[in-house]
């Protein structure tokens, strides 16, 4: 069976909006009025992975792009990057783990949690205009919470 | 009111080097990114390149090494810096306004162009 | 690399002409597909973005389909102003790209 997916943006708890700020990075930051339609529009997939009430697995492909989040080391440290597939064979079920993210729903917000790396989070930061990162804590400086918007297909 | 206005077009010696710059106004460079596309007499549209809005460039391959585009945020202005300049390259060179509509790149809307002849 | 083709190169048509311009791209774009009108010493001009939305202020006799490879422009009724070039342009990709626009298609009086 086809892998299910959903047309969705995403801001965090601050309400800063996501958008591409280079051919393959993210950075956070508020946006209103006409500039909302900046904002990038994910295409979430719905994957294999270990699945429990408040966590299930998902991929985040940005919609009608080859490019997917992706989380790997580099110089030692888990990070967080946009990786180009093959558009022949994603999305598919079984993502390889770098692509997946646990999605875990506390208090009506969301945190994305590296498969790869356990307590590795997608994270932003406090300041306006700075890149989306993968970050090793929670509840810090840093932030870990969404919100989701649906988009329609 | 959006509008983008570029200058520093002119005639240059083959050779030579030339920096067009495009002037911004009713949006934020921080938002979006900027492309350049020129137009050789009677031709079609060419595709230069992007400046991101988070700064890093992005360029048609064939464009890559003499071509150089750049961004000044606190002065709402973007740069296409041209060396070797060759007869080749004479044209209208036009700067546009990226809009990423559902992740989709659109041109929208576009400066007026500025003329660059390069002839000795 | 994707490529984008157009076709035809030049057309001539009659006011009131239904005028179909095609363009195709070398692999999928899904539907990351603008379409531009451009007249002589002008600037282009946004008609068509995301392959079918008309962009702000254009006349619906301009029309836009398709998706994947394959897409296509349609005037319905051809008016005078519309004499001018048309170009389609991907915006899926970026890399490794030689030019995002096709040809041009040029809508000549007939």
């Known amino acids: 069976a086809p892998v299910r997916s959903l047309n969705c943006t995403l801001r965090d708890s601050q309400q800063k909006s996501l958008v591409m700020s280079g051919p393959y990075e993210l950075k956070a930051l508020h946006l209103q009025g006409q500039d909302m339609e900046q904002q990038v529009v994910f295409s979430m997939s719905f994957v294999q992975g270990e699945e429990s009430n408040d966590k299930i697995p998902v991929a985040l492909g940005l919609k009608e792009k080859n490019l997917y989040l992706s989380c790997v080391l580099k110089d030692d440290k888990p990070t967080l990057q946009l990786e180009s597939v093959d558009p022949k064979n994603y999305p598919k079920k079984k993502m390889e783990k770098r692509f997946v993210f646990n999605k875990i729903e506390i208090n009506n917000k969301l945190e994305f949690e590296s498969a790869q790396f356990p307590n590795w989070y997608i994270s932003t930061s406090q300041a306006e205009n700075m890149p989306v990162f993968l970050g090793g804590t929670k509840g810090g400086q840093d932030i870990t919470d969404f919100t989701m918007q649906f988009v329609s297909s | 009111e959006v509008q983008l206005v570029e200058s520093g077009g002119g005639l240059v010696q083959p050779g030579g080097s030339l920096r067009l710059s495009c002037a911004v106004s009713?949006?934020?460079?921080?938002?979006?990114?900027m492309t350049w596309v020129r137009q050789a007499p009677g031709k079609g549209l060419e595709w230069i390149g992007y400046?991101?809005?988070?700064?890093?460039?992005s360029y048609a391959s064939w464009a890559k090494g003499r071509f150089t585009i750049s961004k000044d945020s606190s002065k709402n202005t973007v740069y296409l810096q041209i060396n070797s300049l060759r007869a080749e390259d004479t044209a209208v060179y036009f700067c546009?306004?990226?809009?990423?509509?559902?992740?989709?790149?659109?041109?929208?809307?576009w400066g007026p162009g500025t003329l660059v002849t390069v002839s000795s | 690399d994707i490529q984008m083709t157009q076709s035809p190169s030049s057309v001539s048509a009659s006011v009131g002409d239904r005028v179909t311009i095609k363009c195709q791209a070398s692999?999928?774009?899904?539907?990351?597909l603008a379409w531009y009108q451009q007249k002589p010493g002008k600037r282009p001009k946004l008609l068509i973005y995301?392959?079918?939305t008309l962009a702000s202020g254009v006349p619906s006799r301009f029309s836009g389909s398709g998706s994947g490879t394959d897409f296509t422009l349609t005037i319905s009724s051809l008016q005078p102003e519309d004499f001018a070039t048309y170009y389609c342009?991907?915006?899926?990709?970026?890399?490794?790209?030689?030019?995002?626009f096709g040809g041009g298609t040029k809508v000549e009086i007939k």
């Open positions: 400046i991101w809005s988070g700064g890093s460039a």
């Open positions: 546009a306004r990226v809009k990423m509509i559902s992740n989709i790149e659109t041109f929208d809307p």
């Open positions: 995301r392959a079918s």
């Open positions: 009713g949006f934020s460079l921080d938002v979006y990114t």
């Open positions: 692999e999928r774009i899904y539907s990351g």
């Open positions: 342009q991907q915006g899926v990709s970026s890399s490794d790209i030689d030019n995002v």
